[in-house]
């Protein structure tokens, strides 16, 4: 089912010259990253 598709997609992404670390970096919170610069930028 859906779980199998997700697993396959994840496995394929790893095969496309990606590492788990690079995937986690991509998922890094934009909110956390913004803390390293002008924190109020883009805030409401």
């Amino acid at each position: 089912g859906g779980g199998g598709s997700k697993h396959k997609c994840f496995r394929n992404s790893l095969e496309n010259n990606e590492t788990l670390e690079s995937i986690m970096n991509t998922l890094e919170s934009e909110e956390d990253f913004r803390k390293y610069f002008y924190y109020l930028e883009g805030s409401k």
Epitope: N25, E30, K35, F37, Y38, Y39, E41
Partner: antibody
């Protein structure tokens, strides 16, 4: 006016420690991430470390990880860099830079020189 | 780490003439928020670096409109439309898309 001023540099022997300071003025220090960047004599720029606006998040270049510690005191508008186990290759001008809008380093200090030599 | 390269490394220019510096990154600088965090810095002799351009093409406050930035993805350019004596120095591109933040090796601009 908006500025940052570094201090604390000097000549130190290999293996010893040094603490740099960066005094900020003219802006709300506690709203900005702050960075240290260094430049060895006659060489290019190297990013060293960053601390988030509130001090909760830090990141370091591999070359200084485990030896350097960045910290800040928002009540004093001051950024610090504690440098331990110093090596000859740490010899450089150390600049404090503000992480500004557009994820850019928009304000730079004049730098403080650190020389590691026996 | 993202490696930044610049060409040329040295650029002798004539006063009043244009100059162009190229910067290339080893991987795309487009962040997940859709922005590209590529900036250009100028370092005059004996001075600290100074921000010229951020997010590829945005001039920082006080920077003359003689300076312009362009590019996308992995290829970027800084152009000086008419070089003035004040422009002598080293120009660095820098990426703040991904840790560790990295700089290009610098391009030295001087007058012929």
């Amino acid at each position: 006016q908006v500025q940052v001023v570094e201090s604390g540099g000097g000549v130190v022997q290999p293996g010893r420690s040094l603490r740099l300071s960066c005094a900020a003025s003219g802006f709300t220090f506690s709203n900005y991430g702050m960075h240290w960047v260094r430049q060895a004599p006659g060489k290019g720029l190297e990013w060293v470390t960053v601390i988030s606006y509130d001090g909760s998040n830090k990141n370091y270049a591999d070359s200084v990880k485990g030896r350097f510690t960045i910290s800040r005191d928002n009540s004093k508008n001051t950024l610090y860099l504690q440098m331990n186990s110093l090596r000859a290759e740490d010899t450089a001008m150390y600049y404090c830079a503000r992480g500004g809008s557009g994820f850019a380093f928009d304000i730079w200090g004049q730098g403080t020189m650190v020389t590691v030599s026996s | 780490d993202i490696v930044m390269t610049q060409t040329p490394l040295s650029s002798p220019v004539t006063l009043g003439q244009p100059a162009s510096i190229s910067c290339r990154s080893s991987q795309s600088l487009v962040r997940s928020d859709g922005n590209t965090y590529l900036s250009w810095l100028q370092q005059r002799p004996g001075q600290p670096p100074r921000l010229l351009i951020y997010k590829i093409s945005n001039r920082f406050s006080g920077v003359p409109d003689r300076f312009s930035g362009s590019g996308a993805g992995t290829d970027f350019t800084l152009k000086i439309s008419r070089v003035e004596a004040d422009d002598v120095g080293v120009y660095y591109c820098m990426q703040t898309t991904q840790f560790p933040f990295t700089f290009g090796p610098g391009t030295k601009v001087d007058i012929k």
